[in-house]
Interface confidence: low
């Protein structure tokens, strides 16, 4: 595919990535799908600097990121290694809490009102952030 060299309209460029911040809420899977349809992924936080950037833009609102443990171990949607990567969980989190009464535990990660992370029920309709990297090959077929 062709390389993306600039961000789509209404996306914000920061450190060679493009970000889109939702203003409505979706379940994690729907948010994940939304980003994929935009040739992007739910945001993957790889540094404290990126954490601060995203936190600044989303403010004190629960917001999905591209981190989940629906299949067992915690995984970033783009394959970034979770164990060795950046983490910013709230104290005592993730806790896979079952006491919410919604069935099952908590398998999807989100930014909380202070920016730190929490695991929550994936069906909750939170805002979300999409991210796509500049210079990566897009999924569009090449022009012949």
């Amino acid at each position: 595919g062709s390389e993306r060299t600039c961000c789509p309209v209404n996306w914000v460029e920061h450190e060679r990535s493009c970000y889109w911040f939702s203003r409505s809420g979706k379940a994690w899977a729907d948010a994940d799908n939304y980003c994929r349809l935009e040739d992007a992924h739910l945001v993957v936080v790889t540094s404290w600097e990126e954490q601060k950037f995203v936190q600044h833009h989303i403010g004190p609102v629960n917001t999905w990121m591209g981190l989940h443990d629906q299949n067992g171990p915690w995984k970033w949607v783009d394959g970034t290694d979770y164990e060795t990567g950046f983490k910013n969980w709230r104290p005592e989190q993730p806790d896979d809490w079952y006491g919410h009464g919604l069935g099952g535990g908590e398998d999807c990660a989100h930014f909380t009102d202070d920016g730190r992370w929490n695991d929550d029920v994936c069906q909750r309709p939170y805002r979300w952030v999409c991210e796509t990297e500049l210079d990566k090959a897009s999924q569009e077929p090449p022009l012949l």
């Epitope: 961000c7 996306w11 914000v12 460029e13 911040f21 203003r23 950037f53 600044h56 833009h57 403010g59």
Partner: antibody
Framework: QVQLQESGPGLVNPSQTLSLTCGVS??????????WSWIRQHPGKGLEWIGY???????YYNPSLKSRVSISLDTPKNQFSLKLTSVTAADTAVYYC???????????????WGQGTLVTVSS | QSVLTQPPSASGTPGQRVTISCSGS????????VSWYQQLPGTAPKLLIY???HRPSGVPDRFSGSKSGTSASLAISGLQSEDEADYYC???????????FGGGTKLTVL
């Protein structure tokens, strides 16, 4: 403390291009947390957002002006500029530059503002 | 015509409490935060309230903001002669994908 100062011609001929520059002192336009904005106020009327630019060059424009407006950065000079093409008398206004906080639910938190410059479109 | 609707004028006597309203829709005030500006005669607007009810440092606590549904209000208590100015509300608009302003309210201190 960040201060902004607009500069540019006060008189522009109809059908020509209006060009203004906003100099920023006391802070860097390269900050990753602010958007740099242009807003105008027609004589005796309310405020109208023109558009803004992020440090990375991402731009956002008022849909009603999008076809005629362009905002650009000059990072080494710590300034940003507005170009408005094909102007008419309806573009006569006081033009302000301002810093937009640009974060969560906050576009519209303009602070500080330049003192404004009156641009008259007339031959 | 402005996207956000404000009364064109308001008035009060010194010491009184005055409220200025700002009406919008679900695409702006209903879903986003409101800010308020004070524009003294011949000067640039000054940020008075941000995020519905927050005051920047230096703004007297006589000024307060609130939001309910698709409307917002600016209240000024203990009105003073120096409060005579134009007041504007603003909010992000999801449809226009940009910030929008009210038409402004001219406050007269009698």
């Amino acid at each position: 403390q960040v201060q902004l100062q607009e500069s540019g011609p006060g008189l522009v001929n109809p059908s020509q291009t209006l060009s203004l520059t906003c100099g920023v002192s006391g802070g860097s336009i390269s900050s990753g947390y602010y958007y740099w904005s242009w807003i105008r106020q027609h004589p005796g009327k309310g405020l109208e957002w023109i558009g803004y630019i992020y440090y990375s060059g991402s731009t956002y424009y008022n849909p009603s002006l999008k076809s005629r407006v362009s905002i650009s950065l000059d990072t080494p000079k710590n300034q940003f500029s507005l170009k408005l093409t094909s102007v008419t008398a309806a573009d006569t206004a006081v033009y302000y530059c301002a810093r937009d906080w640009g974060g969560y639910d906050s576009s519209g938190w303009f602070d500080p503002w330049g003192q404004g410059t009156l641009v008259t479109v007339s031959s | 015509q402005s996207v956000l609707t404000q009364p064109p004028s308001a008035s009060g006597t010194p010491g009184q409490r005055v409220t200025i309203s700002c009406s919008g829709s679900s695409s702006n005030i209903g879903n986003n935060a409101v800010s308020w500006y004070q524009q003294l005669p011949g000067t640039a607007p000054k940020l008075l309230i941000y995020s519905n009810d927050h005051r920047p440092s230096g703004v007297p606590d006589r000024f307060s903001g609130s939001k309910s549904g698709t409307s917002a209000s600016l209240a000024i208590s203990g009105l003073q002669s120096e409060d005579e100015a134009d007041y504007y509300c603003a909010a992000w608009d999801d449809s226009l994908k940009g910030p929008v302003f009210g038409g402004g309210t001219k406050l007269t201190v009698l």
